[in-house]
């Protein structure tokens, strides 16, 4: 039988390349059994973790998994750094793995196909 | 149901660039992490890297200057390049699926063999 | 990288006996909080099939025969009680840090 107890499953050293302008969510994905804990975002400032009050989160729940997720509408260029969740259980503060946005200004990304376009083109 | 199917040459010449496919079907590339492996002729199994549902990759520090790992949202595919291969490359290549809670790979594609020879 | 090693390499077992394989880490693979420590079987000619997640954690579909157990550096796949379809090699895998890797396979033959 699985264990109960809360998990959040951010990737160890995870990384997302992403555009300012775009719109993009991260995923923390969080295991629980019967009671959904409360899960904050926060982003690192230093050694300390700075919450992110008045950000849009949202629950998603996909194939039993569930996913908080923290958006970003539109991606801003102080959006880059790091970022943690982190879930209050039964008085238990459990934090994940910290993970890195590194954010592209528009401006200098215009000139350049993304990812997905070279792919795509290459494979055509 | 998930499944993946590898696609590529069974045989590249040394030298030469390596470019296998990966087809998705029964879930979004855009969500979890997808995974390359290799075994080789002695049963080693290595992993190679993965493309993440945002687009952003890791490779084996092992591979990392010979390796890239795309992949296009549109036809839920997601491709291998492995450069300058030599017969050291023999293997047959596996593409993976990682489960969120906890990356173990829980759909793999049936491999697809390499041989690379003159 | 963390270093899994398999023992035994092969392993001959009776029908209806116990087959026990183990697997040492060279670091401790708890960051998670848990054990990302998951072990697969390799039939001739088949890709890789996930028995265990998690250190002990049965997937779905697979029989209660396999059982998975262990933290921190050993771990251990125990199939009870063998069957002659069970013929494979057994690998080990972490993920609890990048690169992932496996261990070196176990081959379990029926005696």
């Known amino acids: 039988k699985e264990s109960c107890d809360v998990q959040l499953y951010i990737k160890r050293q995870s990384e997302h390349s992403i555009l300012a302008g775009d719109r993009f969510e991260l995923e923390c994905p969080v295991k629980y059994c019967a009671n959904r804990p409360h899960v904050t975002w926060c982003k690192l400032n230093g050694t300390t973790c700075v919450k992110l009050e008045d950000r849009q989160t949202s629950w998603k729940e996909e194939k039993n998994i569930s996913f908080f997720i923290l958006h970003f509408e539109p991606v801003l260029p102080n959006d880059n750094g790091s970022y943690r969740c982190s879930a209050n259980f039964q008085s238990n503060l459990i934090e994940s793995h910290s993970t890195t946005l590194y954010v592209t200004d528009v401006k200098s990304a215009s000139e350049r196909p993304s990812k997905d376009e070279m792919a795509s083109r290459f494979w055509a | 149901e998930v499944q993946l199917q590898e696609s590529g040459p069974s045989l590249v010449k040394p030298s030469q660039t390596l470019s296998l496919t990966c087809s998705v079907t029964?879930?979004?590339?855009?969500?979890?992490?997808w995974n390359w492996i290799r075994k080789f002729p002695g049963n080693k199994l290595e992993y190679m890297g993965y493309i993440s549902y945002s687009g952003s990759t890791y490779f084996n520090p092992s591979l990392k200057s010979r390796i890239s790992i795309t992949r296009n949202t549109s036809k839920n595919q997601y491709y291998l390049q492995l450069n300058s291969v030599t017969t050291e490359d023999t293997a047959t290549y596996y593409c993976?699926?990682?489960?969120?809670?906890?990356?173990?790979?829980?759909?793999w594609g049936h491999g697809t063999t390499l041989t690379v020879s003159s | 990288d963390i270093v899994l090693t398999q023992s035994p390499a092969s392993l001959a077992v009776s029908l209806g006996q116990r087959a026990t394989i183990s697997c040492r880490a060279s670091e401790t693979i708890d960051s998670y909080g848990d054990s990302l420590m998951h072990w697969y079987q390799q039939k001739a000619g088949q890709p890789p099939k996930l028995l265990i997640y998690r250190a002990s954690n049965l997937e779905s579909g697979i029989p209660a025969r396999f059982s998975g157990s262990g933290s921190r550096t050993d771990f251990t796949l125990t199939i009870n009680p063998v069957e002659a379809d069970d013929v494979a090699t057994y690998y080990c895998?972490?993920?609890?840090?990048?690169?992932?890797?496996f261990g070196g396979g176990t081959k379990l033959e029926i005696k």
């Open positions: 029964g879930d979004s590339i855009t969500s979890a992490y």
């Open positions: 993976a699926r990682s489960h969120y809670y906890g990356y173990y790979f829980d759909y």
């Open positions: 895998q972490q993920t609890d840090e990048d690169p992932y890797t």
